[in-house]
Amino acid sequence: TEVKVTQPEKSVSVAAGDSTILNCTVTSLLPVGPIRWYRGVGQSRLLIYSFTGEHFPRIRNVSDTTKRNNMDFSIRISNVTPEDAGTYYCVKFQRGSSEPDTEIQSGGGTEVYVLAK
């Protein structure tokens, strides 16, 4: 059965300077491959976070993703700024065989509104 990526919130509002959680769960970890968060769509989309060990300032995972059966790939963004506004997508990839990873499923997106403090 095909993996499903669920982002339960269509939108979230957060005051500038505060933190927000963007929720994402998957129904399967197979086929193997990373899960990444992007802001925007298409060629101009921006990588926000990748669950592949790198450090991303102001962003961290919510659950213990070192659990081998973890299906929760939610993230917390701290000290939100107006520049963080936009639609965020949680994307499941299949690892590439000597070629780039292939996107196989995306969540529906969560729009982040940043309110003035």
Partner: antibody, heavy 118, light 108 residues
Framework: DVQLVESGGGVVRPGESLRLSCAAS????????MSWVRQAPGKGLEWLAG????????YYPASVKGRFTISRDNSKNTLYLQMNTLTAEDTAVYYC???????????WGLGTLVTVSS | SYELTQPPSVSVSPGQTARITCSGG??????YAWYQQKPGQAPVTLIY???KRPSNIPERFSGSSSGTTVTLTISGVQAEDEADYYC???????????FGGGTKLTVL
């Protein structure tokens, strides 16, 4: 620099128990999953146990499940392996290893030798 | 018995290219790594996530995959590369870490 130092090995008799320790430094221990791997004399590598960063989830191959127990104390940056009912087949060098994001191993300790002999 | 299959030995002359293969895992559920072990020493990670090389590993070591077979390639083999090489995997379907039986690389 990442450092993993195993201790607790030695000579034990068949049927006895032993607890190995692995002291970690040079990285945020509480953020990484860890594993134990052993190597019998003249043989290949065998994965024995894995544990999540928080310590709540543990994983074993069928060959040692129920006899070996992996645990960790994040306040002490230390990983443990409790081994019960040891037999001569458990004679090996035991290594602790840090896991990558996808549960492969990037850093290894120098190992500690366990000899089970009557 | 080992879940992953490697040739027991590979021989190569200095300066030549050595290739060590590993098979047996399902491509959709496995990640692979390669570990080098010299006599009396602990293993050292050469390649992880199929083809990623730690920063301290020389560029002559590379990993690739094709279907259910992964390959460790050592270009311009040097005498110091003589060692045992282990293929290791992570199987997401069983949460286990199988190894191959190891390949002894002899530099002629």
């Amino acid at each position: 620099d990442v450092q993993l130092v195993e201790s607790g090995g030695g000579v034990v008799r068949p049927g006895e128990s032993l607890r190995l320790s692995c002291a970690a430094s040079g990285f945020t221990f509480s953020s990484n999953a860890m594993s134990w791997v052993r190597q019998a004399p003249g043989k290949g590598l065998e994965w024995l146990a894995g544990i999540s960063a928080g310590g709540s989830d543990t994983y074993y191959p069928a060959s040692v499940k129920g006899r070996f127990t992996i645990s960790r104390d994040n306040s002490k940056n230390t990983l443990y392996l409790q081994m019960n009912t040891l037999t001569a087949e458990d004679t090996a060098v035991y290594y602790c290893a840090r896991e990558t994001w996808n549960h492969l191993f990037d850093y290894w300790g120098l190992g500690t030798l366990v000899t089970v002999s009557s | 018995s080992y879940e992953l299959t490697q040739p027991p030995s590979v021989s190569v002359s200095p300066g030549q290219t050595a290739r060590i293969t590993c098979s047996g895992g399902s491509y959709s559920s496995y990640y692979y790594a390669w570990y080098q072990q010299k006599p009396g020493q602990a293993p050292v990670t050469l390649i992880y996530s199929d083809d990623k090389r730690p920063s301290n590993i020389p560029e002559r070591f590379s990993g690739s995959s094709s279907g259910t077979t992964v390959t460790l390639t050592i270009s311009g083999v040097q005498a110091e590369d003589e060692a045992d090489y282990y293929c290791g995997g992570y199987d997401q379907s069983s949460y286990t870490n199988p190894f191959g039986g190891g390949t002894k690389l002899t530099v002629l």
